[in-house]
């Protein structure tokens, strides 16, 4: 069967987000992938979206991320814009209203996005073959 257009959009967004790092992609998020053995695919997507939402809600106005110049501000706005897009598309793919995120493990946002990209690429390779 054909791959969902949303999945392609997610991979595209993740490709962009992982092209470069910023000060704030080095901040930590809940690592939902550390122990996701008994989690359904939809739950994983829902929990990933929840983690991203928590991150940008918490850091959108974080002065460490916003920086001191117009260019640094633009960079942070870019990060938040792409994370919101990713969040929106992940919710669409998950089709769930809410999901718990209780893990204690942490990873950097950068590593979280890389791991998510790997998962999404694997899903894409299965649905496109």
């Amino acid at each position: 069967h054909k791959c969902d257009i949303t999945l392609q959009e997610i991979i595209k967004t993740l490709n962009s987000l992982t092209e470069q790092k910023t000060l704030c992609t080095e901040l930590t998020v809940t690592d939902i992938f550390a122990a996701s053995k008994n989690t359904t695919e939809k739950e994983t997507f829902c929990r990933a979206a929840t983690v991203l939402r928590q991150f940008y809600s918490h850091h959108e106005k974080d002065t460490r991320c916003l920086g001191a110049t117009a260019q640094q501000f633009h960079r942070h706005k870019q990060l938040i814009r792409f994370l919101k897009r990713l969040d929106r598309n992940l919710w669409g793919l998950a089709g769930l209203n809410s999901c718990p995120v209780k893990e204690a493990n942490q990873s950097t946002l950068e590593n979280f996005l890389e791991r998510l990209k790997t998962i999404m690429r694997e899903k894409y390779s299965k649905c496109s073959s």
């Epitope: 962009s16 910023t22 640094q72």
Partner: antibody, heavy 118, light 107 residues
């Protein structure tokens, strides 16, 4: 594959005008900012202008402020550089370059030569 | 405007040499410095961004370091394809400014 292709360069007299185009492909145009950078013959790189393609907000170098105008046609994935009141010192190869998602300029066009001479 | 001063302006080196190029900003740019490589008749290529992060596909022999006002590009073992001109650039604030370039020539 990301590609930037400039066009519109040529020979123009001092005081004249020229419009350069930068056609982008292989990515979502409004996701990345766009720059124009120039290089006079045998010289180094000089940044000219930057535009936020999402908002259309430009920022110019002092050397071109009031003379050069950057604009976008998002339907054509193209950035334009309108250059008026050209001077001999504007003679250079003009490159358009995509702003990296956060830093630097990660993709560059091949450049187009602008010669201002009488 | 922030001035970026590169040194040396040119250097001669042999294949296998370790090459270091420095860039000094006229005021702090925190970590917002990038390095580009340009070959004659070609467009520049992004090598390093955010002081020390190699751009996609850039060989590991290229590394960047520094912070504040002093930045360094190091080529650990010069290869034939590395003979080119290198530019530093700050993107801390507009106007974005470049160093004057360092030409790396064959000894």
């Amino acid at each position: 594959e990301v590609q930037l292709v400039e066009s519109g360069g040529g020979l123009v007299q001092p005081g004249g005008s020229l419009r350069l185009s930068c056609a982008a492909s292989g990515y979502t145009f409004t996701d990345y900012s766009m720059h124009w950078v120039r290089q006079a013959p045998g010289k180094g790189l000089e940044w000219v202008v930057w535009i936020n393609t999402e908002t259309g907000e430009p920022t110019y170098a002092d050397s071109v402020k009031g003379r050069f105008t950057i604009s976008l046609d998002n339907s054509k994935n193209t950035a334009y550089l309108q250059m008026n009141s050209l001077r001999a010192e504007d003679t250079a190869v003009y490159y358009c370059a995509r702003g990296g998602i956060f830093y630097g300029m990660d993709y560059w066009g091949q450049g187009t030569l602008v010669t201002v001479s009488s | 405007d922030i001035q970026m001063t590169q040194s040396p302006s040119s250097l001669s080196a042999s294949v296998g040499d370790r090459v270091t190029i420095t860039c000094k900003a006229s005021q702090s740019v925190i970590n917002d410095a990038a390095w580009y490589q340009q070959k004659p008749g070609k467009a520049p290529k992004l090598l390093i961004y955010y002081t020390s992060h190699r751009y996609t596909g850039v060989p590991s022999r290229f590394s960047g370091s520094g912070s504040g006002t002093d930045f360094t590009l190091t080529i650990s073992s010069l290869q034939p394809e590395d003979f080119a001109t290198y530019y530093c650039q700050q993107d801390y604030t507009s106007p974005w400014t470049f160093g004057q370039g360092t030409k790396v020539e064959i000894k």
